[in-house]
Interface confidence: medium
């Protein structure tokens, strides 16, 4: 019989008392064979973290800084449930640490040296740890003691709770550095007052501080936020201009065998019965014998953290960077005038081989990182393990939702000014065998389908989006009798046609022979009725252009396109017979890497791009024998985006809307995780 007990870790006598009350009250609202609570008392949160890792307890609620400690080896805990604040309709699980300045002050984030700073308090998240962690590498050496380095960086500060005797500059703007509300510049409101009064030039607070202190929009308009990319934004654009996004209070559990579903079942029932305004006899978010016992008193409920989310993703790149800098005293980034090597993310074995070859040829400018799926690559770029990769539009959408930005676009047409002229896009088409003469767009039900991969543009988002509008449900595996859509659930009928062996069957990488444009076309040739690909796929794999045994004798004339009006046309008439225009593949990266990725890739394509005439004896960046490794093989150059530098602008309103409509059918665990951080 599986153990259905959740052992909650308490860190004080008062918490233990509340935990016992929690345990007793839950017995009446959960079935006797359902989850139950047991209480484990430890001396501190760190002891709780160790106890959970050692399987002596199962759960505890932690602030962000402790979530980071819990994630570090050997603890390896993960966030499983988040407290939320505000309303159920608009639940807030995160706050944003921001740098507020007066509108007319005219300096940027990289010009803070010599300015006067206002902090909520020494050692506090938004007011100290995050800004000082992110500025750590700009601090004058020696950086220890930290307070001295900070004092020498700013020309004067108010950092309540600092030692005014040892570090008088930190108390220059608030004599005495008092560590309570007796100090008018203490806490969030105090730090903002320090800026407002003109004592300081910048205040490090949370996003809500300015709204709580200035009810009038006209007053708020006198202030701006400093962004990490050295721009400024209005104070209400904090979601796009902050130092870090910080989770408020989170339940953690073991990464393996952590009972996360059981913990959620328990807490979901708990909030149903003992949440805000539910019960007089016991209240989950109330602490009669103290403050914030087990859970924050200000919490309104719980949300399940998506399973794909580990602590690094949950805490976010900026927060992890700040805390790691402070804890480890490391400075990972090189000086801004010199770019570190770009860590390219390669999918599985074949891409890794090409990437390694690129790395050798680049003489250290490119390094390679491997992952098994595109989503794993995106996650690695998010958390800094990798820096960049080129993505199909469908994944540009997911990457964008995860905070990454497009930096260069693949161009497929030869032109004099290739690098300066990003193209409008390519065509998504539906290809059938000419011999299957009765097949049209209107009678695809029950047929065998071939897709590049789930979540990709031509192979999935466009055809399935159109299909969804017609059938009004997501059961595409029931619409087609069988198919190959790499990335589908292994037991789905949309994996039945795939050819990968063993664990590689239906995997969304080149280990699955029917993956990608060429793979989907091969699936049509060998097994399927219809393939959803790009307009260049058929000509690129027929007429002897693909020497592989399955393709070498194929003739373009043996294939036709399905048009949306129910007619069919020859392959070359794609401009008048396609499903939609698809945005070109694009290179994505983190915002902080944008300039360096742009610079290094421009250099690399000048060395190894289309200007290389002999690819048999030289490394060619855009060639891989029709396998589309790292980049599409028909790439002519990587083009500047000009002002299309966000995922929405790059993909275009129409495509973003189409993918948004398909969201309800999404099986992307990463998209679910990223929309949890930014709904």
């Amino acid at each position: 019989v599986p153990d259905k007990t959740v052992r909650w870790c308490a860190v004080s006598e008062h918490e233990a008392t509340k935990c016992q009350s929690f345990r007793d009250h839950m017995k009446s609202v959960i079935p006797s064979d359902g989850p139950s609570v047991a209480c484990v008392k430890k001396a501190s949160y760190l002891d709780c973290i160790r106890a959970i890792a050692a399987n002596e307890a199962d759960a505890v609620t932690l602030d962000a800084g402790l979530v980071y400690d819990a994630y570090l080896a050997p603890n390896n805990l993960k966030p499983v449930v988040a407290e939320f604040y505000g309303s159920k309709e608009d639940p807030q699980t995160f706050y944003y640490a921001v740098a507020v300045v007066k509108k007319d002050s005219g300096f940027q984030m990289n010009q803070l040296r010599g300015k006067k700073s206002c902090h909520t308090g020494l050692g506090r998240s938004a007011g100290w740890n995050i800004p000082i962690g992110l500025l750590y590498c700009d601090l004058p050496e020696p950086r220890k003691p930290l307070e001295k380095a900070v004092a020498n960086f700013f020309s004067g500060s108010c950092a309540p709770c600092a030692d005014g005797t040892d570090f008088p500059q930190l108390c220059q703007l608030c004599p005495g550095c008092g560590c309570s509300t007796l100090n008018q510049y203490f806490g969030y409101s105090g730090a903002f007052k320090c800026l407002k009064d003109g004592a300081g030039d910048v205040a490090f607070v949370k996003h809500s501080t300015i709204f709580e202190n200035l009810a009038n929009k006209a007053d708020r308009d006198q202030y701006e936020l400093l962004c990490l990319d050295n721009t400024r934004k209005p104070v209400d654009e904090y979601k796009d201009c902050h130092l870090a996004q910080v989770p408020s209070h989170t339940v953690v559990a073991r990464s393996m065998g952590g009972k996360e579903d059981l913990i959620w079942e328990l807490l979901n029932q708990a909030q149903e019965h003992f949440g805000k305004d539910k019960s007089k006899e016991f209240q989950l978010f109330s602490s009669p014998h103290g403050k914030d016992l087990l859970f924050k008193d200000s919490a309104h409920g719980f949300l399940k953290v998506p399973p794909r989310m580990d602590a690094k993703m949950y805490l976010g790149y900026e927060y992890v960077t700040a805390i790691r800098n402070l804890r480890e005293g490391t400075c990972p980034e090189a000086p801004t005038d010199e770019c570190k090597p770009v860590k390219w993310c390669a999918l599985s074995h074949h891409e890794r081989l090409k990437c390694d070859e690129w790395s050798v040829n680049s003489v250290g400018k490119i390094e390679c990182v491997s992952a098994e799926t595109t989503e794993d690559c995106i996650a690695k770029i998010m958390n800094g393990e990798a820096d960049a990769m080129s993505l199909d539009g469908g994944f540009v959408y997911i990457a964008g939702k995860c905070g990454l930005v497009p930096v260069l676009a693949e161009n497929y047409n030869k032109s004099d000014n290739c690098e300066d002229t990003p193209e409008a896009g390519y065509f998504a088409i539906a290809v059938v065998k000419k011999s299957a003469s009765d097949l049209t767009w209107d009678n695809l039900k029950g047929k065998k389908s071939c897709h590049t991969a789930v979540g990709r543009t031509a192979g999935w988002n466009i055809p399935m989006g159109l299909l969804y509008n017609k059938i009004n449900h997501c059961r595409f595996d029931e619409f087609f009798s069988e198919g190959c859509a790499p990335g589908s659930k292994k037991d789905s009928s949309l994996c039945k046609l795939c050819m990968g062996s063993g664990l590689n069957l239906c995997e969304p990488n080149n280990k699955e022979g029917y993956y990608g444009y060429t793979g989907a076309f091969r699936c049509l040739v060998e097994k399927g009725d219809v393939a959803f690909v790009k307009h260049q796929t058929v000509p690129q794999n027929t007429g002897g252009k693909n020497p592989d045994p399955w393709a070498k004798n194929l003739n373009e004339k043996d294939y036709e396109l399905l048009c949306l009006d129910g007619t069919r046309k020859p392959v070359e008439e794609y401009a008048n017979c396609h499903l939609a225009r698809a945005p070109n593949h694009a290179v994505v990266t983190r915002k902080d890497k944008e300039a360096c990725v742009h610079k290094i890739l421009r250099q690399q394509q000048h060395l190894f791009g289309s200007n290389v005439t002999d690819c048999s004896g030289n490394f060619c960046l855009f060639r891989s024998e029709t396998k589309d490794l790292l980049f599409r093989d028909d790439t002519v150059c990587l083009a500047k985006l000009h002002d299309r530098n966000t995922y929405e602008k790059y993909l275009g309103e129409e495509y973003v809307k189409a993918v948004g409509n398909l969201r309800k059918c999404s099986t992307s665990s990463l998209l679910e995780a990223c929309t949890f951080r930014r709904p």
Partner: nanobody, 128 residues
Framework: EVQLVESGGGLVQPGGSLRLSCAAS????????MGWFRQAPGKGLEGVAV????????YYADSVKGRFTISEDNSKNTLYLQMNSLRAEDTAVYYC?????????????????????WGQGTLVTVSS
């Protein structure tokens, strides 16, 4: 209005398999106990299998453990019961049920008294 609609019942030989489906509509799926109950001719309601929707625990009656599997598809708001190695004593009308709201529990998850939304039932007959 919350509705549960069962399907998949029928006549099957001993040792055979059937898969029952229960489509839920009219409420936010996830975060409730939902399960399968059965009533054999002349007998009372018996709990067969229950799960906590949205990826939670599963619960089975001893008589079906190892033979029946309860599962869900969140995207379709649908609950399933895969019944293998069927026996004559499994013959019954199978009902899908949902425990909505704040009903107090002093009983097991397989106790029909805690469930307040019921489907119309689907007949399963196991006979050679």
């Amino acid at each position: 209005e919350v509705q549960l609609v069962e399907s998949g019942g029928g006549l099957v030989q001993p040792g055979g398999s059937l898969r029952l489906s229960c489509a839920a509509s009219g409420h936010a799926y996830g975060g409730n106990y939902m399960g399968w109950f059965r009533q054999a001719p002349g007998k009372g309601l018996e709990g067969v299998a229950v799960l906590y929707t949205g990826g939670g625990s599963t619960y089975y009656a001893d008589s079906v453990k190892g033979r029946f599997t309860i599962s869900e598809d969140n995207s379709k708001n649908t609950l399933y019961l895969q019944m293998n190695s069927l026996r004559a004593e499994d013959t019954a009308v199978y009902y899908c049920a949902l425990a909505l709201g704040s009903a107090r529990w002093y009983t097991s998850s397989l106790d029909a008294r805690a469930y307040n939304i019921w489907g119309q039932g689907t007949l399963v007959t196991v006979s050679s």
